[in-house]
């Protein structure tokens, strides 16, 4: 874990992140809430909205077409990961070829997980951990041999399962609600400020 002084207003040492957060006026669509203070560049935010973008060559449509309602949560998830300067308390060192740091056990507000899970009910996948085990021979992820496509609820029977398992426990579901100052919101209205600043401060204090 990082020293206490580096838990607030920091960017991960990962594939596309800035070294330090700064304003980024041209952030695209769903990433725009982070434009006042961002760890992502404008071109990263544009790529976050694309299928099989250059960011990670990740194919959301690996089991047929993902519904727009579902996909927008994965875009928002990407924006949070790439752009948020408020994930410092959960940054961990990692020995991976493509990044030196990752997030672990970020407490996502329960409503954000519930909404994500409900909106992906009618989409399909073939795996419960999307970080590993794919067939990448085509240059993008495809289902490995023997992994059958089923509705999301088959692989993620609860909203907690979706949030915690999909990215190797990068997230966990918080028991706290949006607006509590105790959980990270994937979705927020920037007109009312970034609520995750207060959350990061709370957990940084708790960890010191």
């Amino acid at each position: 874990a990082r020293p206490r002084t580096e838990l607030l207003n920091v960017c991960m040492d990962a594939k596309h992140h800035k070294e330090k957060p700064s304003p980024e006026d041209g952030l695209h669509k769903q990433c725009s809430p982070w434009k006042k203070n961002s760890c992502c560049f404008a071109n990263t935010s544009r790529e976050a909205h694309k299928d099989i973008s250059y960011l990670y060559r990740f194919n959301w449509n690996h089991c047929g077409s993902m519904t727009p309602a579902c996909k927008k949560h994965f875009i928002q998830d990407t924006c949070l990961y790439e752009c948020s300067p408020n994930l410092g308390p959960w940054i961990q060192e990692v020995n991976q070829s493509w990044r030196k740091e990752r997030i672990l056990h970020v407490p996502l507000c329960k409503e954000d997980c519930e909404q994500w899970w409900q909106d992906c009910r009618t989409s399909y996948t073939c795996k419960s951990n999307w970080h590993k085990g794919w067939n990448w021979t085509s240059g993008y992820n495809q289902c490995p041999e023997g992994a059958a496509c089923h509705p999301f609820h088959f692989y993620f029977p609860t909203s907690a399962a979706l949030c915690s398992e999909i990215w190797s426990h990068s997230y966990k579901v918080s028991n706290y609600s949006r607006g509590s100052g105790r959980c990270i919101q994937m979705w927020f209205d920037p007109a009312q400020g970034n609520p995750n600043e207060e959350v990061a401060r709370f957990y940084a204090r708790a960890m010191s």
Epitope: A69, K110, E111, D112, E114, Q115, Q118, G179, F188
Partner: nanobody, 127 residues
Framework: QVQLVESGGGSVQAGGSLRLSCAAS????????MGWFRQAPGKEREAVGG????????YYADSVRGRFTISQDNAQNTVYLQMNSLKPEDTATYYC????????????????????WGQGTQVTVSS
């Protein structure tokens, strides 16, 4: 405060459909969270579902998921509740509610989160 007016209630046979409307006025916010609730005589108020108009994100109570659909018409400042495959147990007075808060998930189903309420419209489903 937001002014809310519901319409579209009435009587229908089981298996039938109705569409309720909730027209909002008198607010300056860009976006609203709007919820639908219902109350049958002698019973507790029950959440039906809700929508955050900024992202058109909807969330439903288990009792109606798959049968009811909430949608919006931004030009008309109106939110709709399309009710299909109606059952006698759907009989109730239906209310819409609104708040400028950004609600999603089960937050949309919490009556304490809303500060403006309509007068309600009656729905009767006979077998």
């Amino acid at each position: 405060q937001v002014q809310l007016v519901e319409s579209g209630g009435g009587s229908v046979q089981a298996g039938g459909s109705l569409r309720l409307s909730c027209a909002a006025s008198g607010y300056t916010y860009r976006r609203l969270s709007m919820g639908w609730f219902r109350q049958a005589p002698g019973k507790e108020r029950e959440a039906v579902g809700g929508i955050y108009t900024g992202e058109s994100m909807t969330y439903y109570a288990d009792s109606v998921r798959g049968r009811f659909t909430i949608s919006q018409d931004n030009a008309q400042n109106t939110v709709y509740l399309q009710m299909n495959s109606l059952k006698p147990e759907d009989t109730a007075t239906y209310y819409c509610a609104a708040t400028p808060q950004f609600l999603i998930g089960s937050g949309l189903l919490r009556p304490d989160k809303y500060d403006s309420w309509g007068q309600g419209t009656q729905v009767t489903v006979s077998s």
